[in-house]
Each structure stands twice: as C-alpha cells, then as structure tokens.
Interface confidence: low
C-alpha cells in the first residue's frame, strides 16, 4: 500500500498569507505576487546578484511537528542562470542553502542563526536561461530533502540566500503513514512511518471479526518503512470454525455446509449420513443410527457398525478346526472393520458348556483380526464346540448390539499323534509320538502297526500305555512303514501319518545310532 | 473552520426506512474518517457506525448490524446513513462526527478512534 | 464488548471546586481513551484524547490520567462555563463504548 502524506506546511496552498520572516528586514527575499498559467501565485524571490555578498534569510512561521518523526521537504524554485546579467555579475550565485532548527517554542520575530542547522545546499537541474526568462518560460525545479529525527514540538526551515536570482514557488512540508490498511484478515492502523531509513516500525495487526491466529501460528503484524509503504507482512488471521474468507472478511458457513477449524480452506458441504447444519456450522451432526468415532474428522461421512460376517464355516480336522468366514455386506460405510473369535465347548454326557479360550489355541490372535480365517488346534475329542465370529469397526463401541454369526462343531477323534524315530539298529527301531495333552487323559492305549514296505500281505500290532516303544526282530538294512493310533474308550482316535523307518545295514551296526 | 450539518430525520414507522445526509465543509473531507453516534432521549451516547477515509473499512454496532449501511461520497463531501427496519429503539438524535489522524499526535494511532468534530445532531423518531 | 462505568452519576459542585470524574474500563483499554463535554442540546465536544492529551483549544483546567482500566478527567476550578455532563469513551476496539456520563450540576 503506497505511503500517505500528512502535509504541515504548503507554501503554494497558503495564498501569500504566511508571513514568514525575513532578515534582514526589507531587504533580500521578498513575497512577490506573479500570474503562472492563468493563475496568481505567490512566491518569496531575491535576485542581488550584483551587490557583492549576500547573506539573506527567508525564514518560515513555527510548524508544529506533532507525531512527524521525520519531515519530507519539497521545494519548487526557480534559478535564473547568472550568465543572462549584464557584466556576468561576479558575486552572483545559483544555489541557496537550506535550513532547519527545533525548539519547543514560538520565538516569534526572534531570529538567530547560530540555532539553525544546514540540511544541504540546493542547486537547480536547469537554471532559467536569458531566453526563457523573456519567453516566460520558467524551468521549473523540484528537490526533496528529509530530516529526522525530529524530538522537540516544532520546527522552522530557512532559506539562506548568498547571491543568487532565485524564486521559491512552493515549499511542502510533510511527513508519511502507512495508511490504514486490511491484509491477511488482520486490520492495520494508520502508522506514522519512522525517522531512520534502515529501520521499519513494527505494527501490531487486528484479527477482522471471526478470524483468529491459528494455534502455533504467528500474531500479524507488518512494518511501516520511512517512505510510508507497508513492507514484510508477518504472520496472518484464518477465518475460525464455522467461518470462510470472503474477498477481507469471514463470512459464517452457509446452512448445509460447515468449517471444523480456523484454516485457509473454504466451508465443506455436510458429508453423507448428516443432518444439515444451521449458518455458522462447525460440523454436522449424524443421522440417527449413525455416529462419528472420536478419531473421525469432521468432514468424514457419519457410519454404522457393521453386519456380521456374511458367511461362516467350520472345518474339522481331527482335533483342529479350520474357521473361514466372508466379510459383512454392509461395511457401515468404513473399512476399520476387524474380527473377534471367541469359543465354546460343550460336554456331550452332561450338556454343561464354558468358554474354552484357555484351552485352546488359536494360529493368530483371535481379537482384532483383519484377515478372514483362523486354525483352532488342541480342541478335545469327543466335545461340542460352538465358535462366534464378530465383526466391528471404529464405531461399534458406541452402540451396545453385536455384529455375530456362529458354527458349531462335535469333535470325535484325538489328534493324530505326531511320531519320530528315536533310534535304530540294524535289527531294531525306537519310535515315540505325543499328542496334545488335554487329550491324552482320553487315551486309554496306542497302537503301533508295522510292516516292511513293499509287503501289503503282512503287517504286525504292538499296543503300549506309553509314549514310545521299541519294535524288535527286524530285518536289516529294511524300510518298515509305520503308523501310531490312539484308542479312547469310545472307539480308535485318529490314526497317526504312516512314516517310513529303515533299520541300519550290518556294516555301519553301531547299536541305536540316529 | 470544521463544519458538519445533519439532515434527513423525521418521524418514521416501525419497519420503515430513512437516509441521514452529513455534509462536510471547512476541511479535507477525504482525509477524515468519518462516524455516526445517536443519543436516546434523556440517555448517553452510543456509537453505531464508522467509514474509513476512502469508504473503507467500515464497522457497525451490534444493535444496527444488518439494518443500518453508512457510505459516503468524497466528491461531494457528504457522509450517508441508511437506515433500514427501524425500531422504536432507534429513536435518538444522531450526531455524524469526524476524525483526521493528522490531529492525532501519537507515535502510532489508536486502534479505533475518537471524534474530534462533531455535527448538530438530527432527531430520528421511530413511533406509530 | 468493552464496558465503561463513570462514577458518579451526579455530582454537585460550586464555581472554584475541584472535580474529579472516574471512568472504569471492564478491561485493560491501555490509554485509548478520550472525554468529551455535553451541554444539553448541544452535541458533545471533544476535552481530552489518548487519556491525558489536552484536544486544540480546551483550557488547561481540564486535564486527564489513567491507564489499563482506570481513568480520572480533573476540572481543577469549576467555572460557569463547565456545568454540562462529561462522557468517557474507548476506543481500544472496534465498539468504541461511551460511558453512561456525569452530570456537574450547580451546588
């Protein structure tokens, strides 16, 4: 914004009636009327160009300073060229000197010197030639002085003439502010501009109505250089919630639309699921039976929990369980959705049932699973378990109904035991198994079955209450398949996975070496 | 030397409308912000609005934001009231009053301002 | 808005007395703060801005103090000319807020 100009002294504007002094008295500068363009104007003019030295001050009338820290002076004068005299006139001049001096108070017709301080000496661009003097044509100078600081309540200027042929057609005094100004949303006040030219003021700016510093952000505030100009704003105001920028103003969001927090962005229309919102709206709030999680942002459409899996199956495999289920079909509109697993089992004999979390084991854990099937082992034989899938997203803890489906399942065989070869000879093999043990006080005996590969006509049964046993009376260097089966009192559990064990040859005998 | 003369109040009924006229002389109107302050029958003063020197920025009162809009014509040195949806409460002398900041000797001005000039006033009735 | 409370309402006092008006501020208003003189009919005229800045023309008697939230305007001899009703006023903000004034009336 360009500087504004606080005029304290125009000498053109005044008609002649300023009356400033001049020394010596009636002699020297003079106040001359003269027609320029069709119109008077006055003018203080001395031309003593042939009277040896001269010494002639023209002073002005006390100017208040006021809030001016640094005065601009222009001056519009004239200077004839001393060539155009007759003789060259030896003592003539073509500058003057200017002036100033402070004081508190009006001196009045006081006049000294020795208190007045030369700001510079003015010399013209173009001196008015003998030619233009005659045509009328006066050459027109402008020059611009400032000084400053000022510190006291007033001040004069002076014009020493030492010789020269000049006219002073105008004298402005003035001093610059930074207008009034509204940038970034902030209001600046009209400030007067500083008296050093490297240093700018700094001005405080004020939020327009509805607007704010954003949090962390800085306090406007811009700088108000020596020439009046607004330079290195800093800082700004946003338009707070429920508030947008229109051209230097925050106008309130208009029904159906709302602004979450003081920003640069425009108000938002009232997402999906929302109510609309009255003017000035800060968020729209959530049709019935859909709702907002805390972490939700405002602009985010309102949801619902979700349907429950769409489709659940359980797959027996002896003593685990393979679940699988299809997400829901009605997501709720967002995609948080996880699943919980939870379990049940049930004895046959006596129908009691009790949550069976803790004794069985699940191949990830079975709360906040993101992918859609989970393995259930060390389940009991002989045992109903029923297993609930549920499905959540971020706003199912704001309502108290479940999303669930569940399958059941009867468990009627033990695990497989799980067999390894401990040792071999070359006319024996030790074999051991486990299994899990909630299953193992089920078991009432184990089974081994044996025979030699390749021969499907013939095989041998050891039975054992043990976890292991030594199979005798085999045939070196032989491969034997064998297989381990637990037997419950209900019947045969599952039957191991049928291994292959080769006894040792008779030259590398070293008895039950691995 | 300042002057400022009000015209254009009268009685008027509520819902009605009325234009206040201040005209400026004696000084560089331009240069002047420029503000409209009411008086209620046997009550204080109140400010309702302000213009700045070129038309803006401009401020209202909460009691006439909406209803009242002040405007001004530097050409012809004349600052405007235009008052809409008049109530009863509205009823005051209504004072156009200035401000030149080249008066205002501070470092910096004020956040607003004052009013160093001030018209004759113009009375407003709002009656059935 | 910004709140102004001038106290008294009516004070009565003869020529030659020294007067004292207070102004509160229902906030810190720094010394934004400017007193006028009403007589009745009249509009209001302009004593004393920036607090303590005695306005082109205003005689010396008058004079101001204050800052934050408390403000004093002084007549320090009451004269003929002086009996009228004296308003404060902020200009801090935006609302500029007058005072509810105080009548000097004649003792």
């Known amino acids: 914004a360009q500087g504004k100009e606080v005029v304290l002294l125009d000498f053109a504007a005044a008609g002649g009636e300023l009356g400033w002094l001049t020394h010596p008295y009636g002699k020297g500068w003079d106040l001359m009327q003269n027609i320029m363009n069709d119109m008077p104007i006055y003018m203080y003019s001395v031309c003593n160009v042939m009277s040896g030295d001269q010494d002639n001050w023209l002073r002005t009338n006390w100017v208040y300073r006021g809030e001016a820290e640094r005065i601009f002076i222009e001056l519009k004068f004239t200077v004839r060229d001393c060539n155009s005299f007759p003789g060259g006139a030896s003592s003539c001049k073509e500058t003057f000197n200017l002036y100033y001096a402070e004081s508190d108070l009006d001196y009045g017709t006081n006049f000294q010197k020795r208190l007045f301080t030369k700001i510079d000496t003015i010399a013209p661009d173009e001196i008015t030639v003998s030619s233009d003097f005659e045509a009328r044509h006066v050459k027109l100078n402008v020059e611009e002085r400032s000084v400053g600081p000022l510190t006291r309540k007033g001040f004069y200027l002076a014009f020493q003439d030492i010789g020269a042929c000049v006219a002073l057609l105008s004298v402005r005094v003035y001093y610059k502010k930074c207008p009034e100004l509204l940038q970034g949303l902030a209001h600046f006040p009209e400030t007067i501009a500083g008296s050093d030219a490297p240093s700018l003021a700094t001005v405080a700016g004020t939020c327009v109505d509805h607007a704010v510093v954003p949090p962390g952000g800085e306090e406007p505030r811009m700088h108000c250089a020596v020439d009046g100009e607004w330079l290195v704003p800093i800082g700004q105001c946003l338009c707070q919630a429920g508030y947008e920028k229109v051209e230097d103003a925050c106008q309130a969001c208009s029904p159906g639309f709302f602004k979450f927090e003081a920003s640069e962005s425009p108000c938002l229309e009232c997402p999906e699921h929302t109510l609309p919102s009255p003017e000035g709206a800060t968020s729209c709030e959530c049709e019935e039976g859909f709702f907002r999680a805390p972490q939700d942002p405002a602009s985010m459409p309102c949801t619902r929990p979700p349907s429950a899996p769409h489709y659940l199956t359980a797959v027996g495999m002896g003593a685990k369980v393979e679940l699988r289920w299809t997400p829901p079909q009605d997501s709720g509109g967002r995609e948080d959705i996880v699943y919980s697993v939870t379990c049940e089992q049930c004895w046959p004999e006596s129908g009691e049932c009790g949550p069976c979390e803790a004794s069985v084991r699940y191949s990830e854990p079975p709360h906040g699973l993101t992918r859609t099937s989970v393995t259930v082992s060390d389940l009991e034989p002989h045992m109903n378990y029923t297993f609930t899938v549920e499905a959540r997203n971020g706003v199912s803890g704001l309502v108290t109904s479940r999303s669930f489906r569940t399958a059941s399942v009867s468990i009627n065989q033990t695990e497989p035991p799980k067999v390894r070869l401990e040792g071999r000879s070359t006319t024996s093999l030790s074999v051991s198994w486990s299994i899990p043990p909630p299953q193992q006080s089920r078991v009432w005996k184990y089974e081994v079955t044996y025979r030699k590969k390749g021969d499907s006509n013939s095989y041998n049964v050891r039975r054992t209450e043990g976890f292991s046993v030594t199979l005798d009376d085999l045939a070196p260097d032989t491969t034997y398949l064998v297989q381990v089966q637990a037997l419950t009192q209900e019947g045969q559990g599952a039957g191991s996975k049928v291994h292959e064990f080769q006894t040792l040859s008779p030259e590398g005998s070293g008895n039950l070496a691995v | 030397e300042v002057q400022l003369l009000e015209s254009g109040g009268g009685l008027v009924q509520p819902g009605g409308s009325l234009r206040l006229s201040c005209a400026a002389s004696?000084?560089?109107?331009?240069?002047?912000?420029m503000a409209w302050v009411r008086q209620a029958p046997g009550k204080g003063l109140e400010w309702v609005s302000r213009i700045g020197p070129s038309g803006g920025p401009t401020h209202y009162a909460d009691s006439v934001k909406g209803r009242f809009t002040i405007s001004r014509d530097n050409s012809k040195n004349t600052l405007y009231l235009q008052m809409n949806s008049l109530r009863a409460e509205d009823t005051a002398v209504y004072y156009c009053?200035?401000?030149?900041?080249?008066?205002?000797?501070?470092?910096?001005?004020?956040?607003?301002?004052?009013?160093?000039?001030w018209g004759q006033g113009t009375l407003v009735t709002v009656s059935s | 808005d910004i709140q102004m409370t001038q106290s008294p309402s009516t004070l009565s006092a003869s020529v030659g007395d020294r007067v004292t008006i207070t102004c509160r501020a229902s906030q810190s208003i720094s010394t934004w703060l400017a007193w006028y003189q009403q007589k009745p009919g009249k509009a209001p005229k302009l004593l004393i801005y920036?607090?303590?800045n005695l306005h082109t023309g205003v005689p010396s008697r008058f004079s101001g103090s204050g800052s934050g939230t408390e403000f004093t305007l002084t007549i320090s001899s009451l004269q003929p000319d002086d009996f009228a009703t004296y308003y404060c006023?902020?200009?801090?903000?935006?609302?500029?807020?007058f005072g509810q004034g105080t009548k000097v009336e004649i003792k």
């Open positions: 004696g000084f560089t109107f331009s240069h002047y912000m």
């Open positions: 006023q902020q200009y801090n903000s935006y609302s500029r807020t």
């Open positions: 009053a200035g401000y030149d900041s080249g008066y205002d000797y501070v470092a910096v001005a004020g956040p607003a301002e004052y009013f160093q000039h």
């Open positions: 920036k607090a303590s």
